[in-house]
């Protein structure tokens, strides 16, 4: 029986050009975490596998850093990064738990008001 729950940062916002940490935490279960996937609806960003370590998708290699922990740091944000991110915890013996984070990337205040200077 799956007793665990995923806690996430929920809805977050960050400025264009900045960075953000995507973080999930699995609680209320003694199941062993064997792999964590970080995905968008249409593509995988990264996998942290207990045996194989980290794999970062080539599409994100230049601006995704593993960690902290099982989290993911997304750098050099663009407005196209706005959207939903999924942390998928593969566990034994429970199975798979999924959490979601909605990221909104905002135009930076410098960019917004740059024309005034």
């Amino acid at each position: 029986m799956m007793t665990g729950t995923i806690e996430t940062t929920g809805n977050i916002s960050a400025e264009k050009g900045g960075s953000i940490i995507l973080q999930c935490h699995l609680s209320s279960t003694t199941a062993q975490v064997t792999q964590v996937n970080w995905e968008q609806q249409d593509q995988l960003l990264a996998i942290c596998n207990a045996d194989l370590g980290w794999h970062i998708s080539p599409s994100f290699k230049d601006r995704v850093a593993p960690g902290p922990g099982l989290g993911l740091t997304l750098q050099s944000l663009t407005v196209n990064d706005t959207g939903e991110y999924f942390c998928i915890y593969h566990t034994y013996p429970d199975g798979t738990y999924t959490g979601r984070i909605f990221l909104e990337v905002l135009e930076s205040s410098v960019a917004e008001h740059g024309a005034r200077f």
Epitope: Q43, L44, I47, N49, H55, T98
Partner: antibody, heavy 118, light 107 residues
Framework: QVQLQESGPGLVKPSQTLSLTCTVT?????????WNWIRQPPGKGLEWMGY???????RYNPSLKSRVTISRDTSKNQFSLKLSSVTAEDTATYYC???????????WGQGTLVTVSS | DIVMTQSHSFLSASVGDRVSITCKAS??????VAWYQQKPGQAPELLIY???YRYTGVPDRFTGSGSGTDFTLTISSLQAEDVAVYYC?????????FGQGTKLEMK
């Protein structure tokens, strides 16, 4: 439990538009997941065509160019496939399926055979 | 697009045999591979996802392994009801693609 059921004409004429609908029971298509179309020509392998996500955004297989459109009717808990300018090569069994996290297909309709012929 | 290649279109084995079906991805997909079983006239059924995780209700004689580009589905002791076509699929990014299938027959 989640069930998917394809419906639509079994015969379509060349150059016309193929239209199929998938009715989902046991789960709201606006709650979560992405809702896909996958086809299989007779005696051949599987081809992913595209999906519409629970939020309404669609993604298509570039191999089908701009011939494919997936839409939804949330009031009926249905999603639909339109494939334009069909030829005999589009003859296939068409399946609707739910994509999970990660992107595997755990729930499928039983499939419907569509023949393209004059 | 990522191409998934199953080296054997057909495999023949006897009840009780250990059977391995292989699949190769055209690029590194880490562990993002699923396996399906399809019996005649039926929709595919999910067996394995993320290379090695057995889907709910799948008998434990089915095991998935591999990472990177090379993946294997193993049936530890073949049963008569395992006669089917087996497909691999990458779930790395869209467009999702499938192998051409391996038809498993009884000797």
């Amino acid at each position: 439990q989640v069930q998917l059921q394809e419906s639509g004409p079994g015969l379509v004429k060349p150059s016309q538009t193929l239209s199929l609908t998938c009715t989902v029971t046991g789960y709201s298509i606006t709650s979560d997941y992405a809702w896909n179309w996958i086809r299989q020509p007779p005696g051949k392998g599987l081809e992913w065509m595209g999906y519409i996500s629970y939020s309404g955004s669609a993604r298509y297989n570039p191999s089908l160019k701009s011939r494919v459109t997936i839409s939804r009717d949330t009031s009926k808990n249905q999603f639909s496939l339109k494939l334009s300018s069909v030829t005999a090569e589009d003859t296939a069994t068409y399946y609707c399926a739910r994509k999970g996290y990660p992107a595997y297909f755990a729930y499928w309709g039983q499939g419907t055979l569509v023949t393209v012929s004059s | 697009d990522i191409v998934m290649t199953q080296s054997h279109s057909f495999l023949s084995a006897s009840v009780g045999d250990r059977v391995s079906i292989t699949c190769k991805a055209s690029q590194d997909v880490s562990t993002a591979v699923a396996w399906y079983q399809q019996k005649p006239g039926q929709a595919p059924e999910l067996l394995i996802y993320s290379a090695s995780y057995r889907y709910t209700g799948v008998p434990d004689r089915f095991t998935g392994s591999g990472s990177g580009t090379d993946f294997t589905l193993t049936i530890s002791s073949l049963q008569a009801e395992d006669v089917a076509v087996y497909y691999c699929q990458h779930h790395y990014s869209t467009p999702y693609t499938f192998g051409q299938g391996t038809k498993l027959e009884m000797k």
